[in-house]
């Protein structure tokens, strides 16, 4: 396990409707790891979210991070969010910790869609 997981993208863009209930999955993020088997298993988490509005859970089958709405959003109050996520290996033996000190991070821009005024296409 001498490879740490690295995000495929340094920046993601997601949208969420202000009518979405808490617990809604609003999108996925993905990292890759050149190891195999359990050494490639990873855990996603929030590194920065001042608003404490979002959470990330890990789908251990697909190794994707799922961005979850933790608190309902209100378009009039705030309609743009930015959060930073990080990813780490699930299993890291003590002797290989030196390869995993700096977790890979990605930034996620989240745009709230007004239920009264859907986005223009």
């Amino acid at each position: 396990n001498d490879n740490k997981p690295i995000f495929k993208e340094s920046l993601y863009r997601l949208t969420v409707s202000e009518s979405a209930p808490t617990g809604t999955s609003i999108g996925t993020i993905m990292a890759y790891d050149n190891d195999i088997g359990e050494n490639a298993e990873m855990d996603y988490s929030i590194e920065e979210d001042d608003s404490q509005t979002f959470d990330i859970i890990t789908n251990h089958e697909t190794q994707e991070g799922i961005v979850i709405l933790k608190k309902k959003v209100d378009f009039e109050h705030q309609n743009h969010y930015g959060i930073r996520a990080k990813v780490k290996n699930h299993h890291v033996p003590e002797q290989l910790m030196k390869y995993h000190t700096e977790a890979s991070t990605t930034f996620i821009k989240i745009q709230v869609e007004d239920v009264d005024e859907p986005p223009v296409f």
């Epitope: 993208e9 920046l11 608003s51 705030q78 930015g82 930073r84 821009k109 986005p119």
Partner: antibody, heavy 120, light 107 residues
Framework: QVQLQESGPGLVKPSETLSLTCTVS??????????WSWIRQPPGKGLEWIGY???????YYNPSLKSRVTISVDTSKNQFSLKLSSVTAADTAVYYC????????????WGQGTLVTVSS | EIVLTQSPGTLSLSPGERATLSCRAS???????LAWYQQKPGQAPRLLIY???SRATGIPDRFSGSGSGTDFTLTISRLEPEDFAVYYC????????FGPGTKVDIK
């Protein structure tokens, strides 16, 4: 380094439609996660955000201008455009195009701006 | 919409002095959603600070940002001749609005 360049007529008659184009170089307008905005500044005054577009065509406008604004994107030309209808002298301004940042919605890259005067 | 108020309107200082510029929001905003720009005559604004204390690429460390809630500050620790300009704050949490600007001119 991303560069943006505005182009379009410098003079528009009242009640007509102002049309400007922003050409992006040094990067792709289809880059994931970036939004492309128009911002204006009347002579001697402050800055006003007009609206933005994502490369997919999804746009969001300043509520105060929404009824008159259309922003579109042409990924094949690496350009995005602004149309502002029914203009008056109050729309005279320097118009800037801009791209947001890699860790937030602040405006990281700006064009040099183009002055549009509304006058008959 | 969130209205940003900047004070003072004009700040007259000499090179080498410390400049403290204030930006006040009409309601509370997260500190992660505030930026500062510098604009010189005939030029586009230039991003200085975002988040509200991260310096943009190439911005000297004499520029610093701080604040939370409704009150934010841009500090220029020691004014250089090239720092005399207009400074704008911007919030980007609830749509996008700019303050009216503070002009820093030479005393």
């Amino acid at each position: 380094q991303v560069q943006l360049q505005e182009s379009g007529p410098g003079l528009v008659k009242p009640s007509e439609t102002l049309s400007l184009t922003c050409t992006v170089s040094g990067g792709s307008i289809s880059s994931s996660g970036y939004y492309w905005s128009w911002i204006r500044q009347p002579p001697g005054k402050g800055l006003e955000w007009i609206g933005y577009i994502y490369y997919t065509g999804s746009a969001y406008y300043n509520p105060s201008l929404k009824s008159r604004v259309t922003i579109s994107v042409d990924t094949s030309k690496n350009q995005f455009s602004l149309k502002l209808s029914s203009v008056t002298a109050a729309d005279t301004a320097v118009y800037y195009c801009a791209r947001d940042g890699s860790s937030g919605w602040y405006f990281q890259y700006w064009g040099q701006g183009t002055l549009v005067t509304v006058s008959s | 919409e969130i209205v940003l108020t900047q004070s003072p309107g004009t700040l007259s200082l000499s090179p080498g002095e410390r400049a403290t510029l204030s930006c006040r929001a009409s309601r509370q905003i997260s500190s992660s959603y505030l930026a500062w720009y510098q604009q010189k005559p005939g030029q586009a604004p230039r991003l200085l600070i975002y988040g509200p204390s991260s310096r943009a690429t190439g911005i000297p460390d004499r520029f610093s940002g701080s604040g939370s809630g409704t009150d934010f500050t841009l500090t220029i620790s020691r004014l250089e001749p090239e720092d005399f300009a207009v400074y704008y704050c911007q919030q980007y949490g609830s749509s996008f609005t700019f303050g009216p600007g503070t002009k820093v001119d030479i005393k």
